[in-house]
């Protein structure tokens, strides 16, 4: 379902990744050098920035993100 | 700098009303939600709800629905919380404190209120 | 309701002591974790946010870590101004919900 609206409630922040907040809404996301193999599947839907540098991604599927705007 | 001034001590008697002021400083005011805490003498910290300035809008903790009431007046800049049909178990710390992606920055000095008869 | 556990609930260290306190959460909180430091008469201030972002002008020794439903927050070199009370706070459902708290001692 989705999020109630609060400013009390933290957004989505894939497991191990660095996250910051950008703004009332979104969410700025590092998830840099983690040795990942695949991308983080909890992404939230208010996600404005994503780093996936320095990782093990060799290929994306067709709409890896469905889940961001 | 940030700063959310509240109200002074106040003292009061069981089935009376406290309004607690939380006037806000060095922010725009409508941009940041803002939130309501109490602490019980030696107790811990309870999320009593929040407001979002720029159209009132609000969330209670279940616990704190009804005799709690949340409110704004923007052109002050300030945050209300009014409680009524006080009981002693409502003797705590009140706190404001500011909000925006889930997290609360700059707190209040908080406000004592004291009900006894 | 998210419940939150912290331990201990207090603590004596010594200044130059590294210092570890838990909060466990009752259910999968995601990362959505902060960290607050409390002090008689001052201000609540915020420490960490999202488990492990540190706030603006928070020293380097505190750091947060932690996932699923247990997190701890770290204090490397404990300095004279450190004792104080510390809560951990949940923001993955509403209520937002707070730790017992610990509250640091000087040995």
């Known amino acids: 379902g989705s999020s109630p609206r609060s400013g009390v409630l933290l957004r989505g922040c894939p497991t191990h990744c660095h996250c910051e907040p950008d703004g009332r809404m979104l969410l700025r996301v590092d998830c840099s050098d983690l040795g990942l193999s695949e991308l983080p599947s909890n992404l939230s839907v208010f996600t404005s920035y994503l780093d996936l540098s320095m990782n093990n991604i060799s290929q994306l599927l067709p709409n890896p993100l469905p889940s961001l705007r | 700098q940030v700063q959310l001034v509240q109200s002074g001590s106040e003292l009061k008697k069981p089935g009376a009303s406290v309004k607690v002021s939380c006037k806000a400083s060095g922010y725009t005011f409508t941009n940041y939600w803002m939130q309501w805490v109490r602490q019980a003498p030696g107790q811990g910290l309870e999320w009593i709800g929040e407001i979002d300035p720029s159209d009132s809008y609000t969330n209670y903790n279940q616990g704190f629905t009804g005799r709690f009431v949340l409110s704004v007046d923007t052109s002050v800049s300030t945050a209300y919380l009014q409680i009524s049909s006080l009981k002693a178990e409502d003797t705590a710390v009140y706190y404001c404190?500011?909000?925006?992606?889930?997290?609360?920055?700059?707190w209040g000095q908080g406000t004592t209120v004291t009900v006894s008869s | 309701d998210i419940q939150m556990t912290q331990s201990p609930s207090s603590l004596s260290a010594s200044v130059g002591d590294r210092v570890t306190i838990t909060c466990r959460a009752s259910q999968d909180i995601s990362n959505r974790l902060n960290w607050y430091q409390q002090k008689p008469g001052k201000a609540v201030k915020l420490l960490i946010s999202?488990?492990?972002r540190l706030h603006s002008g928070v020293p380097s020794r505190f750091s947060g870590s932690g996932s699923g439903t247990d997190y701890t927050l770290t204090i490397s070199s404990l300095q004279p101004e450190d004792f104080a009370t510390y809560f951990c706070q949940q923001g993955n459902s509403l209520p937002p919900t707070f730790g017992g708290g610990t509250k640091l001692e000087i040995k």
């Open positions: 999202y488990r492990s």
């Open positions: 404190a500011r909000s925006l992606s889930g997290y609360v920055d700059y």
